[in-house]
């Protein structure tokens, strides 16, 4: 699902307040709900009818430093006999997510949000078939 | 996939620099890659063998204000005949993502990252069957 553009008003103070200096805001350290955890079933990537692999990208100037991308293993889906059925499609499920980018120039450190496209897993889809004339 | 805890060093300046005031950092406004877009196929949520619906949550003090959650429509998966096959499982695919929380006390506005658990879609899984003695 896509993230809309950040509204100009999001970073502004209430109208009755003196304006904020242009370009930067105060970011509190620490993360709300930092201990919240994914409770996804074990090994769904290998037991799915549209299985996938994971690739990890690493960047020490990004939080989270580790971003995991899924790649569907097959074009088709795995049937009850464990064979690939090419009449069906393994299709990636994508999500726009935010990461925090650390930028330093000398001793000046600042942070900026960055939008990243993550493929989270795959799903099996029945395509509608058309014959081109 | 889960986001690890933010390391204490992530918000620190290089060792040779004077230390940062505890508790807050400079956040640049604007978003890197803001125009990047999900290229997910239309209607995969209804064409999937593990179809899902979407629910939208809205919070004006969060960026993005709109967070979309998927819910699997069925316990089982849809077979080639369009019937639910309860020997298979529709399973949610979850992703930890970051949002930006806006906090104001009077005219003081600050921001903090918040971890949110998003169900992005569903996949069809072959369950491991155990018979309990």
């Amino acid at each position: 699902r896509k993230i809309p553009k950040v509204g100009h008003t999001f970073f502004q103070k209430p109208e009755s307040c003196p304006p904020v200096p242009e370009g930067s805001m105060k970011l509190d350290t620490g993360i709300i709900n930092e201990n919240q955890r994914v409770s996804m079933s074990r090994n769904i990537e290998s037991r799915s009818t549209s299985p996938w692999n994971y690739t990890v990208t690493w960047d020490p100037n990004r939080y989270p430093s580790e971003v995991v991308q899924a790649q569907c293993k097959h074009l088709g889906c795995i049937n009850a006999q464990g064979k690939e059925d090419i009449s069906m499609n393994s299709v990636p499920i994508q999500q726009e997510t935010l990461v925090l980018r650390r930028k330093h120039q000398g001793c000046s450190v600042s942070f900026q949000l960055e939008k990243v496209l993550v493929t989270v897993g795959c799903t099996c889809v029945t395509p509608v078939v058309h014959h081109v004339q | 996939r889960k986001i690890p805890k933010v390391g204490h060093t992530f918000f620190q300046k290089p060792e040779s620099c004077p230390p940062v005031p505890e508790g807050s950092m400079k956040l640049d406004t604007g978003i890197i890659n803001e125009n990047q877009r999900v290229s997910m196929s239309r209607n995969i949520e209804s064409r999937s063998t593990s179809p899902w619906n979407y629910t939208v949550t809205w919070d004006p003090n969060r960026y993005p204000s709109e967070v979309v959650q998927a819910q699997c429509k069925h316990l089982g998966c849809i077979n080639a005949q369009g019937k639910e096959d309860i020997s298979m499982n529709s399973v949610p695919i979850q992703q930890e993502t970051l949002v930006l929380r806006r906090k104001h006390q009077g005219c003081s506005v600050s921001f903090q990252l918040e971890k949110v658990l998003v169900t992005v879609g569903c996949t069809c899984v072959t369950p491991v069957v155990h018979h309990v003695q």
Epitope: L75, P127 | R42
Partner: nanobody, 116 residues
């Protein structure tokens, strides 16, 4: 609407080579994969080869592995099938497939005949 233009079929001797191409146009955005199926006289249609658009991942039928190579040109929305060491049993109508994940388009086919 979507158009598929297939070309490159023809008559070739056993052991020879052919290169099929299929160009997609029209509303062919967000391609999932493109590939080829074939149908020999009196037989069922079978998968030959496919290539995923996002990362060029390829799949082949066991019967053509090592002899056929599928490739793509993203900028032209075109897929190619290089067929080497052709055998009489490769004789068939070869159909191009354009897959957009939830919709799949089939071309009209191009005839490949392998005969001496």
């Amino acid at each position: 609407d979507v158009q598929l233009v297939e070309s490159g079929g023809g008559l070739v001797q056993p052991g020879g080579s052919l290169r099929l191409s299929c160009a997609a146009s029209g509303r062919a955005s967000s391609i999932n994969w493109m590939g080829w199926f074939r149908q020999a006289p009196g037989k069922e249609r079978e998968f030959v080869a496919g290539i995923r658009w996002s990362d060029a991942y390829t799949e082949y039928a066991d019967s053509v592995k090592g002899r056929f190579t599928i490739s793509r040109d993203n900028s032209k929305n075109t897929v190619y099938l290089q067929m080497n060491s052709l055998r009489p049993e490769d004789t068939a109508v070869y159909y191009c497939v354009l897959d957009l994940s939830t919709v799949r388009y089939w071309g009209q086919g191009t005839l490949v005949t392998v005969s001496s």
